[in-house]
Interface confidence: low
């Protein structure tokens, strides 16, 4: 009999690795994890187990390689190949992921639903536990505070249209004898959107005695900053790639004058750069390293450290956008993003937010209020404790993606 | 970001000998095979060599036409593949790359230019 | 070796007309296991190093525009440009990975 409970025990843990694993590599979580896609890229889509096995969830079941593979050798989902030398599993490239179309995302969102109500000390596996007989369940966001304590409210994504309606018109569900708040994505927005609406009135005066107060000190402090920054805006224009982008400028000047902001727009024809010294300085020593041929993406460029009145205006716009750039991100309680004018200065913290796969550590504030962003059926920039993340780099290499799914 | 840089390129004479580095970043060095890859001024694209990783007991491949004078090696503790070149020829003047993968090569490095010639 | 043949040596397109390179290798680049071809199609501009466009013949690195595609299976393989933009004036290469990896001769593409 001992011998039989075993069996049963280690079937069990296959299933989990397989679920785990085809999760990782399956059509909702791949697409969205960079680290993941990174390593497909390098080696015609193999990951080395090593790589692996320093997912979290995927560690705590087991680092067992010939465990691993054994599982997978069972799995019916067939989702997954085994490298020869057993040291490599790779998505089966009979099995291509479906293509991401406007059709594909409405998919998703339309079987994406919101639950509240569950106790904040509820785990990943508590849900998952709960969820077992609700349909079949592909992803689940355990939504997140800033301090990323659970709040008590998930987003699941059901493998169907039909099974997300049977299980948001089932009534009275509970866990735990609690009852449960359950709506579709969709409708969950709408209803946020609404409380909003309600709740912007008030904030707008708030905000506007807030201003008059600070208004006199951030216009001296204005007048201290340009002061400081005098003689370090450096203009560039020309007939710009429309690919030219800030991180070309930041490789252009990577070891001649420390950036510190830029206001481009990708595929604008010029753009200002705020260095932390002076301007000419970096431009010369730039031109010194480039035999004093400057370009950008093989274009030529008109470089033109301001001055004057020019110089004053540009300064003063720069530091509103810093400001703008501070208080969405002070707001918002997460790392901010910039879309037209980025910089790395103004996000405190910054890790320029990309997927780095060694070095520093660089990890993402949790989005209180992420839910406005994310009306694509992909969740927005995710950002989960680490106890109880599951789509995630390996340990060794924790950047949470820009992009993540969820905790599944 | 996977970022490749060769070096170590430079004019040397016939019969002399050369070793370009490839330093790599970006990505977890050890468990990727890497490739060299050359270029003469005006040719087409020429596969050198490569260099597979530690399960695989670090097998080196050779393109058959430079077997014997070309010899790559890796150090996974510096993130660094070598390819060392000896009695070198006019003909081996080229651009050389080092690229990253097994069966595509998504990433390329900048490549560093070799010019033999007395 | 697996000797790779493109052809044409060059071509000149009017923007925004097809532009199409054949390559074709000395024996089937097909895996029976994966079902898939072992064909990668390659970019290079003037001064930079190649940028790799497709792999396993026909699927699309991501970050390639979708007017660019390749076909065929065994030995016959295409790289389309379904409408030329300028910046797409390059060499093209394609490559076998079957065995040890080698390069077809290339194909100059230029504006007409």
């Known amino acids: 009999m001992a011998e039989n409970g075993d069996n049963e025990k280690m079937a069990a843990l296959e299933a989990k690795i397989c679920h785990q694993i085809e999760y990782y590599f399956g059509d909702f979580n791949l697409p969205r994890d960079k680290f993941l896609k990174e390593q497909i890229k390098l080696d015609e889509g193999w990951v080395p187990l090593e790589i692996m096995i320093k997912f979290n969830r995927l560690n705590r079941l087991t680092t067992d390689f010939n465990v691993i593979v054994e599982a997978l050798s069972k799995s019916k989902a067939e989702l997954m190949e085994i490298s020869e030398d057993k040291t490599k599993i790779r998505r089966s490239p009979s099995k291509p992921l479906p293509e991401v179309t406007d059709e594909y995302k409405n998919d998703v969102k339309n079987r994406s639903v919101y639950i509240k109500g569950f106790p904040t000390d509820a785990t990943l596996d508590d849900i998952k536990e709960w969820l077992e007989d609700k349909g079949q369940v592909l992803n689940i966001q355990m939504r997140r505070t800033l301090h990323k304590a659970f709040k008590g409210s998930i987003f699941v994504v059901f493998d169907s249209i039909e099974s997300a309606k049977k299980f948001v018109e089932t009534p009275g569900q509970k866990y735990k004898e609690t009852d449960l708040l359950i709506l579709f994505k969709d409708d969950y927005f709408a209803k946020k959107n609404e409380e909003r609406k309600q709740n912007k009135v008030e904030a707008k005066l708030r905000a506007k005695q807030e201003q008059e107060a600070k208004q006199k000190l951030e216009e001296d402090a204005e007048m201290k900053s340009l002061e400081e920054k005098i003689g370090c805006l450096l203009k560039f224009s020309g007939d710009l790639d429309d690919q030219t982008c800030r991180e070309d400028l930041h490789i252009l000047f990577s070891n001649h004058g420390e950036i510190k902001w830029i206001d481009f727009v990708r595929g604008a024809k010029e753009g200002i750069i705020l260095f932390k010294e002076k301007a000419k300085e970096a431009l010369g020593k730039a031109k010194d390293a480039n035999n004093g041929n400057l370009q950008l993406r093989n274009k030529e460029v008109t470089w033109e450290v301001l001055e004057g009145e020019v110089e004053k205006e540009a300064l003063k716009k720069i530091i509103e956008d810093q400001q703008e750039s501070l208080n969405k991100w002070k707001s918002k309680g997460r790392r901010f993003k910039g879309k037209g004018k980025g910089n790395k200065a103004a996000q405190p913290g910054s890790g320029k937010g990309k997927v780095q796969f060694q070095g520093k550590k660089t990890k993402f504030a949790s989005d209180d209020e992420h839910d406005e962003h994310d009306e694509n059926g992909a969740t927005g920039p995710v950002k989960r404790a680490r106890e109880e993340t599951d789509k995630e780099e390996p340990a060794s290499k924790q950047q949470k993606t820009e992009n993540g799914a969820g905790d599944q | 970001e996977v970022q490749l840089v060769e070096s170590g390129g430079g004019l040397v004479q016939p019969g002399g000998s050369l070793r370009l580095s490839c330093a790599a970043s970006?990505?977890?060095?050890?468990?990727?095979?890497m490739n060299w890859v050359r270029q003469a001024p005006g040719k087409g694209l020429e596969w050198v060599g490569q260099?597979?990783?530690?399960?695989?007991?670090?097998?080196?491949y050779y393109s058959d036409s430079l077997k014997g004078r070309f010899t790559i090696s890796r150090d996974d503790s510096k993130s660094i593949t070598y390819l060392q070149m000896n009695s070198l020829r006019a003909e081996d003047t080229a651009v050389y790359y080092c690229?990253?993968?097994?069966?595509?090569?998504?990433?390329w490095g900048q490549g560093t230019l070799v010019t033999v010639s007395s | 070796d697996i000797v790779m043949t493109q052809s044409p040596d060059s071509l000149a397109v009017s923007l925004g007309e097809r532009a199409t390179i054949n390559c074709r290798s000395s024996?089937?680049?097909?895996?029976?296991?994966?079902?898939?071809?072992?064909l990668a199609w390659y970019q290079q501009k003037p001064g930079q190093p190649p940028k790799l466009l497709i792999y396993?013949?026909?699927t699309r690195e991501s970050g390639v525009p979708d007017r660019f595609s390749g076909s065929g299976s065994g030995t016959d393989f295409t790289l389309t440009i379904s409408s030329l933009q300028a910046e797409d004036v390059a060499v093209y290469y394609c490559?076998?990975?079957?065995?040890?990896?080698?390069f077809g001769g290339g194909t100059k593409v230029e504006i007409k």
């Open positions: 690229t990253l993968g097994n069966s595509w090569f998504a990433y």
């Open positions: 970006g990505f977890t060095f050890s468990d990727f095979w």
């Open positions: 260099i597979r990783n530690k399960p695989n007991n670090y097998e080196t």
């Open positions: 024996q089937s680049l097909l895996d029976s296991r994966t079902k898939k071809n072992y």
């Open positions: 396993w013949a026909s």
């Open positions: 490559k076998q990975s079957y065995n040890l990896p080698t």
